[in-house]
């Protein structure tokens, strides 16, 4: 095939609070193509209800996100004239707010020397087998790292962060989830900011 792989992204981001709007965008190499979006493992019926004029532009809006929208998506584009592109890299669309919020803390302290590392601990009141630590920024989408509990049957996950520098803000939240529904996360923990000295 000669059609380059498209890019799939979410606006304003891929980790979305339940009830909030989000738009999945697929962008390929040619203007005249049609776009297709699909969810891995389970058909996403919401996609079939998107107006054709938006589908043709590669826009797939969700006015109010629910658990039904969560999942791993890919897109492609093409036509009978030009064939079909390869599928995009996956986009994991996560819906938050499914469970009560966990607690995020820094060990031994949120005050860290420049160049140093710190342990962030995410604790849940209920036993979950999945945790995610998300780094937040003023003008950037959260970057999240998943982890399992540090011990079997535990409701705590441990994340190592660093080396840190004073040149940016170090803001974190964590989430808990059930690995059977890996795209449905808890409410976010309160924001934790690391204070970098030096």
């Amino acid at each position: 095939g000669h059609l380059p792989k498209p890019t799939l992204w979410a606006e304003p981001g891929s980790v979305i609070t339940q009830g909030s709007p989000v738009t999945l965008r697929c962008q390929g190499g040619q203007e005249t193509q049609e776009y297709r979006l699909y969810r891995e493992k389970k058909t996403a019926l919401w996609i079939t209800r998107i107006p054709q004029e938006l589908v043709k532009k590669g826009q797939f809006p969700i006015p109010s996100i629910t658990w039904e929208h969560a999942g791993r998506y890919r897109c492609y584009y093409g036509s009978d004239t030009a064939g079909r592109s390869e599928s995009s890299d996956p986009l994991e669309l996560v819906v938050t707010g499914a469970y009560i919020k966990p607690t995020l803390s820094a060990q031994p302290s949120p005050v860290v020397n420049s160049g140093g590392n710190v342990i962030l601990q995410c604790d849940s009141q209920v036993a979950f087998d999945g945790f995610s630590l998300c780094k937040e920024g003023e003008d950037e989408h959260p970057q999240c790292l998943n982890s399992q509990p540090h011990a079997r049957g535990s409701s705590r996950a441990i994340f190592s962060v660093g080396p840190v520098s004073p040149s940016r803000r170090w803001w974190y939240r964590c989430y808990a989830y059930d690995s059977n529904s890996p795209y449905e996360w808890s409410l976010p923990s309160d924001l934790l900011e690391l204070l970098v000295l030096g």
Partner: antibody, heavy 118, light 107 residues
């Protein structure tokens, strides 16, 4: 209505080349693709390749060195050429009209039987 | 390549029966599953695309279902003209691959 019809040599000697023509009607080769599929006697279906409306092609990786698909839009004909034939290329060869989004083949020719034998 | 497995190579049924033919993919194919019917004379027809979309002209007694890796084709009320071999095919990625086929015979 959409129709596809294959025509081939019937018998080809080993190491020779196979050429099959698929003549279509009811749709334009400038707008739609044509796919080739074969079926060895008593066995299942094997996808060989596709040529799209713009002339671009996709081939099965196992056959890419021996297979070429081309077309003549004005004559509504698609051509399959398979080189260096062996006895296990003996099969019924089908052309079909694929759709681009699900890669489903909506309409098929009746098939042409090819035997590779000396 | 994605392997498509039709574990039942032949199936015997009576006219009027409800018949289900199954197909399994070696990996998740996200509902990109098509079904074909091949008659004894070699004629091949598309029955269903994208798991459950009935192709034009196909009788409503045919239906498809499934998700992930497991799919099935159901004929709700078997008729004489349905005696044929049925193939599944994945359409998620190239190369396109087919199941080995399930031959439906009359009891």
């Amino acid at each position: 209505q959409v129709q596809l019809k294959e025509s081939g040599p019937g018998l080809v000697a080993p190491s020779q080349s196979l050429s099959i023509t698929c003549t279509v009607s009811g749709f334009s080769l400038t707008s739609y693709g044509v796919s080739w599929v074969r079926q060895p006697p008593g066995k299942g279906l094997e996808w060989l390749g596709i040529i799209w409306g713009d002339g671009s092609t996709n081939y099965h990786s196992a056959l890419v060195s021996r297979l070429s698909i081309s077309k003549d839009n004005s004559k509504s004909q698609v051509f399959l050429k398979l080189n260096s034939l062996q006895t296990d290329d003996t099969a019924t060869y089908y052309c079909a009209k694929p759709n681009w989004d699900y890669y489903a083949m909506d309409y098929w020719g009746q098939g042409t039987s090819v035997t590779v034998s000396s | 390549d994605i392997q498509m497995t039709q574990t039942t190579s032949s199936l015997s049924a009576s006219l009027g029966d409800r018949v289900t033919i199954s197909c399994r993919a070696s990996q998740d194919i996200s509902n990109y599953l098509n079904w074909y019917q091949q008659k004894v004379d070699g004629t091949v027809k598309l029955l269903i695309s994208y798991t459950s979309r009935l192709h034009s002209g196909v009788p409503s007694r045919f239906s498809g279902s499934g998700s992930g890796t497991d799919y099935s084709l159901t004929i709700s009320n078997l008729e004489q003209e349905d005696i044929a071999t049925y193939f599944c095919q994945q359409g998620i990625t190239l190369p396109l691959t087919f199941g080995a086929g399930t031959k439906l015979e009359l009891k």
